[in-house]
Amino acid sequence: MAVTACQGLGFVVSLIGIAGIIAATCMDQWSTQDLYNNPVTAVFNYQGLWRSCVRESSGFTECRGYFTLLGLPAMLQAVRALMIVGIVLGAIGLLVSIFALKCIRIGSMEDSAKANMTLTSGIMFIVSGLCAIAGVSVFANMLVTNFWMSTANMYTGMGGMVQTVQTRYTFGAALFVGWVAGGLTLIGGVMMCIACRGLAPEETNYKAVSYHASGHSVAYKPGGFKASTGFGSNTKNKKIYDGGARTEDEVQSYPSKHDYV
């Protein structure tokens, strides 16, 4: 029962995590304009992996996609790649784990096969989570570097009458979504790996004891059914657990004002 619960919970946590990774990858708020030294701006800039946006105080929001591939910074390309790899691995992991769930019966699939699949999906979730965390961390590091570079530039060459305030960017909501989502996927993957151990019971070798009765030769083998870990062994006695795992995936929608027609 504990194994099923661990597996089910691992699946749910990973599912939420991967949904979060997808959401973070699609979000536009990877970096947002730093308002610390400029709280009076009437124009707010924010950027994602795929496009940059400008929101005016009038509510008009304009987003422009990065239509160039070669002109983009290598770090941004790397972050994109890490996030996509994370999503792909996570999606495959989810697909594998669905079939591996102990509470789902598919034909006459053995526990050993399910254990294998659980381990595979768990590893995939762990790698997926690590990809997301790495991607978000690389982007965050890029932001920190650029932030201090632009801060240094802000306080040089200000001798003239005209002030040119450089736009600085800080961490956007997507980074925090990505970190949390990556962490959840990682935790889910670990839980799946733990569940795998419980799904594959150890081989127990029972020695057959022969009782010789007068007139009849009866061989008696103690033990209800043989527990096996051998791949390809046919375990007939299976306990089916009705796992009622539910996912409540709350998607937060940001209320953007309006676009002019």
């Epitope: 009437a42 800039n45 940059s52 946006c53 009038s58 422009r64 004002k257 309006h258």
Partner: antibody, heavy 118, light 113 residues
Framework: QVQLVQSGAEVKKPGASVKVSCKAS????????IHWIKQAPGQRLEWMGY????????NYNQKFKARVTITADTSASTAYMELSSLRSEDTAVYFC???????????WGQGTLVTVSS | DIVMTQSPDSLAVSLGERATMSCKSS????????????LTWYQQKPGQPPKLLIY???TRESGVPDRFSGSGSGTDFTLTISSLQAEDVAVYYC?????????FGQGTKLEIK
């Protein structure tokens, strides 16, 4: 079409308060900011502040913040600008305006003349 | 606050001639995020509210005659009327739409010579 209709001219004594209204029509009132702009005789236009009727959020020019209050009644599609502790330099035409692309003002009320005189 | 300075204070141009007026801001109005300048031009005739002519420094509002054009970037902007018409006599204002508080120039009064 978008229309902003303001209340009529007001004559007030120094120290009193005035409340100017701006009734909007022809668009979704809760979707756009309503700004208030002052134009004193022979002076440049001065932005006083705005309200976003969708949530009642306001933003004021620090110069007027202590004395101006901008409100909105969404059921009546009307914005209000109240100016307190009136003085002679508050004699001006007050415009309400709806914002547009580039944080510009595309639609204006006809203006309300407020005269502060003892 | 961003200070907007217009020049000249008044301008007299013959009908059919080109009219040019300038607007300078104390800070750059160029937004790096979309490479747009948050400067607006208005026309105001006596007894009327201002009328929007140009936003984003160079985008003409619909219904505004194409003889009106805006140019410039950063801190220096220009409004040009290619061929002055009698109905163009008015006061022209520029406005900062980049930072709060929004500020206006003192205006340029355009007259017919």
């Amino acid at each position: 079409q978008v229309q902003l209709v303001q209340s009529g001219a007001e004559v007030k004594k120094p120290g009193a308060s005035v409340k100017v209204s701006c009734k909007a029509s022809g668009y979704t009132f809760t979707s756009h900011n309503i700004h208030w702009i002052k134009q004193a005789p022979g002076q440049r236009l001065e932005w006083m502040g705005y309200i976003y009727p969708g949530n009642g959020g306001t933003n004021y020019n620090q110069k007027f913040k202590a004395r101006v209050t901008i409100t909105a009644d969404t059921s009546a599609s009307t914005a209000y600008m109240e100016l307190s502790s009136l003085r002679s330099e508050d004699t001006a035409v007050y415009f309400c305006a709806r914002d547009y692309y580039g944080n510009s003002f595309a639609y204006w009320g006809q203006g309300t003349l407020v005269t502060v005189s003892s | 606050d961003i200070v907007m300075t217009q020049s000249p204070d008044s301008l007299a141009v013959s009908l059919g001639e080109r009219a040019t007026m300038s607007c300078k801001s104390s800070q750059s109005l160029l937004n790096s995020g979309n490479q747009k300048n948050y400067l607006t031009w208005y026309q105001q005739k006596p007894g009327q509210p201002p009328k929007l002519l140009i936003y984003w420094a160079s985008t003409r509002e619909s219904g505004v005659p194409d003889r009106f054009s805006g140019s410039g970037s950063g801190t220096d902007f220009t409004l040009t009327i290619s061929s002055l018409q009698a109905e163009d006599v008015a006061v022209y204002y520029c406005q900062n739409g980049y930072r709060f508080p929004f500020t206006f120039g003192q205006g340029t009064k355009l007259e017919i010579k």
